[in-house]
Interface confidence: low
């Protein structure tokens, strides 16, 4: 009997300091460039080696970025999101959503993960 793959979604505030090469990651998504079906959100597509995000270590490829410096990223065109990141300043606060894949046994109970404790 196979187990089921569940997901736990956790949110986290990540504060990055812009480096010489920017924040050190690439994004995909937007209302004109959906990365995930029926979701126009902004996602991290690549973490640049030795960039600010990589050195901080918390941001992961595949993470969804919910806001930048408190500004919601919902319903933005891709280029608008890119511009928002470029103009976000030296100290940048990101609200991100991680998704963990959980190996569950056959008698799993689907429930919400609470990352805060």
């Amino acid at each position: 009997m196979n187990g089921r793959v569940d997901y736990l979604v956790t949110e986290e505030e990540i504060n990055l300091t812009r480096g010489p090469s920017g924040l050190g990651f690439n994004i995909v998504g937007g209302t004109d460039q959906q990365y995930v079906s029926n979701d126009s959100g902004i996602y991290v597509s690549r973490i640049k080696e030795n960039g600010a995000a990589a050195l901080d270590g918390r941001l992961q490829e595949g993470d969804k970025i919910l806001s930048v410096n408190g500004q919601d990223l919902k319903n933005l065109l891709h280029q608008d999101a890119v511009d928002l990141f470029r103009n976000a300043g030296y100290a940048v606060s990101l609200r991100v959503q991680h998704r963990l894949q959980v190996q569950n046994g056959p008698i799993g109970h689907r429930g919400e993960g609470d990352p805060s404790g």
Epitope: N2, G3, R4, V5, Y7, L8, Y35, V36, S37, Y43, A54, L55, D56, G57, R58, Q60, E61, G62, D63, K64, H98, R99, L100, Q101, V102, Q103
Partner: nanobody, 120 residues
């Protein structure tokens, strides 16, 4: 083929310690966020701890200072050292793998029984 096998659970008295292990095959754990999740009887799964590819670690508030997550890249194994265990830590503990790349990609379902930890 990705497989995670958890071990190290058992019955322990309050205040005791256990060390859980999760051996991964099919990919190097050092390139992913890895973590532990637990599920108590009749409850939904709850996040316990995460170690990111950089080595940065995060813990749920109720286990901070008691649990330590670590990894052995050479053995491709994830560990959870659990000290000062409490009855409320009783649960099945599952190894978890961060999703890399496409956010909603679900890898093939696979077997995973977790490891039972009972504090009594």
């Amino acid at each position: 083929h990705v497989q995670l096998v958890e071990s190290g659970g058992g019955l322990v008295q309050p205040g005791g310690s256990l060390r859980l292990s999760c051996t991964a095959s099919g990919y190097p754990i050092s390139t992913y966020a890895m973590g532990w999740v637990r599920q108590a009887p009749g409850k939904g799964p709850e996040w316990v701890a995460t170690i990111y590819y950089s080595g940065v670690t995060h813990y749920r508030n109720s286990v901070k200072g008691r649990f330590t997550i670590s990894r052995d890249n050479a053995k491709n194994t994830l560990h959870l050292q659990m000290n000062s265990l409490k009855p409320e830590d009783t649960a099945v503990y599952y190894c978890a793998k961060g999703v890399n790349g496409t956010y909603l990609r679900v890898e093939a379902e696979y077997r995973g029984q977790g490891t039972q930890v009972t504090v009594s």
